[in-house]
């Protein structure tokens, strides 16, 4: 039986049940290679409390559909008197990066995971030439996730004192230049994740090979190497390589530019101080507030919730968007869709789509940007579920009693962007983490 998601096959992936202190290792095409789980384990569970290992999914007992992968075992489990077998169930959804498997819940018999990934899309529009896992768990099982930094088109410019060269990078995947026909970037070879431009020539100085690694809990490392043979003539016989070290800052701050810290013989060392390198609980909340010692800030957007069936309305040319954030009030137009953001076609108001649901909510404050994300909306033709990204800005003189109003700023591949100036986005900082 062919592997259902070949792009995910090259790596052993990790997921964590934080509540129960359990680490799962997952290999969807082969076995995880952990002795304690046996030779054919595809999903190996490591209980850190009891220091025990259990195989909860066997690679031989795999069954797959386009959106669901199940690994059974021969181990019995007693669920309400019935004689079931322990199994793992991974639900796949279309995403814009390789993504990460997320632990959902576990019963006596079944371990459930969800995975938003390009591998599950109906079309190839989000697929990279080369992409590697872009997250890692530290020794305290806290997740550090750089997926939000991955650029689907374009690149980041590395800050370098050399006026004759420009070094462009992407994070965990190759640089896509198709949207930019005229710039220096267009000359970059396909597959490169680190592209050096000198004059009118562009050189591949690194492609992603291995996933993100953790050095210390505040330092993550990504390494790119030039795969093909054939040395570059300015590298003194050495093969080019790029090392990017992502550093979690010691206190809250605006984002910085990736900086070149060392270069010799085409070995480039880059340091990027960014809060995305911090553990995810420091940056994100499933509610509409971020506060406490954990996050070093106090943010509360709950006053933006609308009551009594009213919604914020944002004009998007062909569409009207109805938003009801930070609550669970149904939007009239999007009846029974559990939508936080509802898209209605102006020319045909019967065409209604959920552009993100209120129970699929993430509030993120990172590198000075405050963002509320609603995902899991109605599917587009690619298989990607519509989502909305609301970028908040502090405005102490916002209208509507300080609440302000969301402004639609555009759509990219079924992701809808809004900006929202409001006094409730004014962040109060604490001092250390």
């Amino acid at each position: 039986q062919a592997a259902p998601f070949p792009e995910l096959c090259s790596y052993t992936w990790e997921a964590v049940d934080t509540k129960n202190n359990v680490l799962y290792k997952i290999n969807i095409c082969g076995s995880v290679d952990i002795v304690q789980c046996g030779p054919s384990s595809a999903v190996c569970m490591h209980d850190l409390k009891t220091r025990t290992y259990h195989s909860v999914g066997d690679s031989v007992l795999r069954s797959a559909t386009r959106s669901l992968l199940e690994f059974n075992t021969t181990v019995s489990c007693d669920q309400q008197g019935t004689n079931h077998r322990v199994q793992s169930s991974i639900a796949f959804l279309c995403g814009k990066t390789l993504g990460t498997p997320e632990f959902v819940t576990a019963t006596e018999c079944v371990h459930y995971f969800e995975w938003r990934t390009t591998a599950a899309c109906k079309k190839d529009i989000f697929k990279a030439n080369k992409e590697v896992p872009c997250y890692v768990f530290d020794e305290e099982l806290r997740k550090h996730d750089l997926n939000p930094l991955i650029k689907l088109s374009g690149a980041y410019l590395v800050d370098d004192s050399d006026p004759d060269t420009s070094l462009f990078i992407n994070v965990c995947r190759d640089i896509d230049t198709l949207r930019d026909p005229g710039s220096q970037l267009r000359a970059c070879p396909p597959g490169t994740a680190a592209c050096l431009v000198r004059g009118h020539q562009a050189f591949d100085v690194g492609q992603p090979r291995d996933g993100l690694k953790v050095v210390r809990k505040d330092r993550l490392v990504l390494s790119y190497v030039r795969e093909e043979a054939g040395k570059l003539d300015f590298c003194d016989g050495h093969s080019p390589a790029v090392t990017i070290t992502f550093v979690c800052p010691s206190e809250r701050r605006e984002g910085t530019i990736p900086k070149l810290t060392a270069k010799s013989n085409c070995r480039y060392e880059i340091e990027w101080i960014t809060e995305y390198a911090c553990h995810r609980d420091y940056l994100e909340s499933k509610t509409c507030s971020l506060s406490g010692e954990q996050q070093d800030v106090s943010i509360d957007l709950t006053p933006l919730a609308q009551s009594g069936g009213s919604s914020y309305i944002s004009d998007g040319k062909e569409y009207l968007f109805y938003l009801n954030v930070c609550g669970e009030t149904e939007i009239q137009f999007c009846n029974k869709k559990q939508a936080a953001v509802c898209q209605v076609k102006k020319s045909d108001t019967s065409q209604v789509k959920a552009a993100g649901r209120y129970h699929n909510q993430t509030l993120r404050y990172s590198d000075g940007d405050l963002t509320l994300i609603y995902f899991g909306g109605d599917e587009c033709s690619s298989g990607f579920q519509r989502m909305s990204v609301i970028n908040f800005r502090c405005n102490k003189t916002a209208g509507n009693d300080g609440k302000g109003t969301p402004v639609f700023t555009g759509e990219v591949d079924c992701t809808y962007f809004f900006t929202w100036d409001t006094e409730y986005a004014c962040v109060h900082h604490h001092h250390h983490h």
Epitope: K151, S153, Y156, L157, D180, R186, N391, T409, V412, T419
Partner: nanobody, 123 residues
Framework: DVQLVESGGGLVQPGGSLRLSCAAS????????WGWFRQAPGKEREFVAA????????SYADSVKGRFTISRDNAKNTIYLQMNSLRPEDTAVYYC????????????????WGQGTLVTVSS
């Protein structure tokens, strides 16, 4: 790719104001970072201001900080440059440009350009 058309240039007295507009059409407006550049006679093209599409964060050349403001109206696919307290040294052709590179102020990293609009500051 993106097509860009600037407007709003003209003759203005020192201390005066102008608002430049840049109308964008073509590919997705929302995937680009936008910049204003200028080129005075006999000089190289220089960075003036930029705005990041994803968060509307802005950056400015030191020479225009506090006087110029870059903004955008996504509903109209238009970028603006509000220029206040204009000085004779601001005289130049002003260009609007689009880039898919983050954190750059280098004109060679901008792939799409308008034709430019002339701003003359003189009494």
């Amino acid at each position: 790719d993106v097509q860009l058309v600037e407007s709003g240039g003209g003759l203005v007295q020192p201390g005066g104001s102008l608002r430049l507009s840049c109308a964008a059409s073509g590919r997705t407006f929302n995937t680009y970072n936008w910049g204003w550049f200028r080129q005075a006679p006999g000089k190289e093209r220089e960075f003036v201001a930029a705005i990041r599409w994803s968060s509307s964060k802005t950056s400015y050349a030191d020479s225009v900080k506090g006087r110029f403001t870059i903004s955008r109206d996504n509903a109209k696919n238009t970028i603006y440059l509000q220029m206040n307290s204009l000085r004779p040294e601001d005289t130049a052709v002003y260009y609007c440009a689009a880039s898919i590179v983050d954190f750059t102020t280098n004109p060679s990293h901008f792939g799409s350009w308008g034709q430019g609009t002339l701003v003359t500051v003189s009494s």
